[in-house]
């Protein structure tokens, strides 16, 4: 892969960035698994969805997630109104009308039912990582990534570039 881009250290949040288009540039249906090949699964419980990180039994079908890609302006660190290039953001939807959301107060990742336009909490900067992995950085909270904690997805603060390769924030996308 391209190597790892480091932690976004800017004091201004990535939500200063603007999504260039309302509609996604492309979409991709994939299964999501951890660096250690555990599957991310979604279960309907008491009319709400729960997210689990688990080992699947042999021949058990993996859950799929629809990734919608958006092109976005990357804000300059020099001044609030400057533009420093482009980045790719994604939203993740495991089932119709539900999207992964970053709950920054609770440091949790939740599935919310919502209508478009989606809130900023549903957008994540997609990082192209080494070893054919990706990571997901919160649009609303730079330096905070989706990660794995106690067999659940959680928001994990990555405080230095060196920690960006921490296995618990690395994920694999596959079509199978």
């Amino acid at each position: 892969a391209f190597g790892i881009s480091g932690v976004q250290k800017y004091t201004r949040a990535l939500h200063d960035s603007s999504i260039t288009g309302i509609s996604p540039i492309t979409e991709y249906l994939a299964s999501l698994s951890t660096y250690n090949d555990q599957s991310i699964t979604f279960a309907l419980e008491d009319e709400s969805y729960e997210i689990y990180v688990e080992d699947l039994k042999k021949d058990e079908k993996k859950d799929k997630v629809l990734l919608s890609y958006y092109e976005s302006q990357h804000p300059s660190n020099e001044s609030g109104d400057g533009v420093d290039g482009k980045m790719l953001m994604v939203t993740l939807s495991p089932t119709k009308d539900f999207w992964l959301h970053a709950n920054n107060k609770e440091h949790s990742v939740e599935l919310h039912k919502c209508e478009k336009p989606l809130p900023d909490q549903a957008f994540f900067v997609l990082h192209n990582m080494h070893s054919n992995c990706v990571s997901f950085e919160c649009k609303t909270d730079p330096g905070v990534f989706i990660g794995v904690k106690d067999n659940h997805l959680a928001l994990i603060k990555v405080d230095s570039s060196e920690n960006l390769c921490t296995e618990n924030i690395l994920f694999k996308l596959s079509e199978t």
Partner: antibody, heavy 119, light 111 residues
Framework: DVNLVESGGGSVKPGGSLKLSCVAS????????MSWVRQTPEKRLEWVAT????????DYVDSVKGRFTISRDDAKNTLYLQMSSLESEDTAMYYC????????????WGAGTTVAVSS | DIVLTQSPGFLVVSLGQRATISCRAS??????????LNWFQQKPGQPPKLLIF???NRGSGVPARFSGSGSGTDFSLNIHPMEEDDTAMYFC?????????FGSGTKLEIK
């Protein structure tokens, strides 16, 4: 403004060494993957090496493995390319490049520094 | 290694007309549902400049007359309407996997 300025190029005999530097400004250097790309006198572009933000990973094109070393000093906002055992095929313009945020493509290029290897 | 074959090597186009440059990859450059094929413009004495990333998305400050299309292994760069300032070398490049590779370039001139 985002800016990359290379230096350290020059003329050297086969088997010699050079160290290229690239000073970055206008962005948070440590947050970005950086690379060296060279352009031959025939105008062919060739990716040489990449170093991740955080210095965790490096990658090289096969033809320079074991001879070139990419490194970075985030405190000095500087990227380096140590070149040794230079060959005539290494003659090229060497560009320092920065990936986009998220690391999907070469987004920013410096003006380049020339390396000439000849006996 | 992924080999990128660009054509034509040399192209002459009249002002206001359409220029089309093709790039064919020896294998798919798709990854995670993205076509990781980029286009660069290089003018004499200058470094390459990003025009298009992920097959069809314009880089910062790139005019709308530049557009990219394609998927899998076949891609094209279109410039319409052609302007005098567009005289340059154009390169495609894949960022799917190491080693990142470039096409051999297309020299575009005004008729």
């Amino acid at each position: 403004d985002v800016n990359l300025v290379e230096s350290g190029g020059g003329s050297v005999k086969p088997g010699g060494s050079l160290k290229l530097s690239c000073v970055a400004s206008g962005f948070t250097f440590s947050s970005f993957s950086m690379s060296w790309v060279r352009q031959t006198p025939e105008k062919r572009l060739e990716w040489v090496a990449t170093i991740s933000g955080g210095k965790t990973f490096t990658d090289y094109v096969d033809s320079v493995k074991g001879r070139f070393t990419i490194s970075r000093d985030d405190a000095k906002n500087t990227l380096y390319l140590q070149m040794s055992s230079l060959e005539s095929e290494d003659t090229a313009m060497y560009y320092c490049t920065r990936a986009n945020y998220g690391n999907w493509f070469f987004e920013v290029w410096g003006a380049g520094t020339t390396v000439a290897v000849s006996s | 290694d992924i080999v990128l074959t660009q054509s034509p090597g040399f192209l002459v186009v009249s002002l206001g007309q359409r220029a089309t440059i093709s790039c064919r990859a020896s294998e798919s450059v798709a990854k995670y549902g993205l076509s990781l094929l980029n286009w660069f413009q290089q003018k004499p004495g200058q470094p390459p400049k990003l025009l298009i990333f992920a097959a069809s998305n314009r880089g910062s400050g790139v005019p709308a007359r530049f557009s990219g299309s394609g998927s899998g292994t076949d891609f094209s760069l279109n410039i319409h309407p052609m302007e005098e300032d567009d005289t340059a070398m154009y390169f495609c490049q894949q960022s799917k996997e190491v080693p990142f590779t470039f096409g051999s370039g297309t020299k575009l001139e005004i008729k």
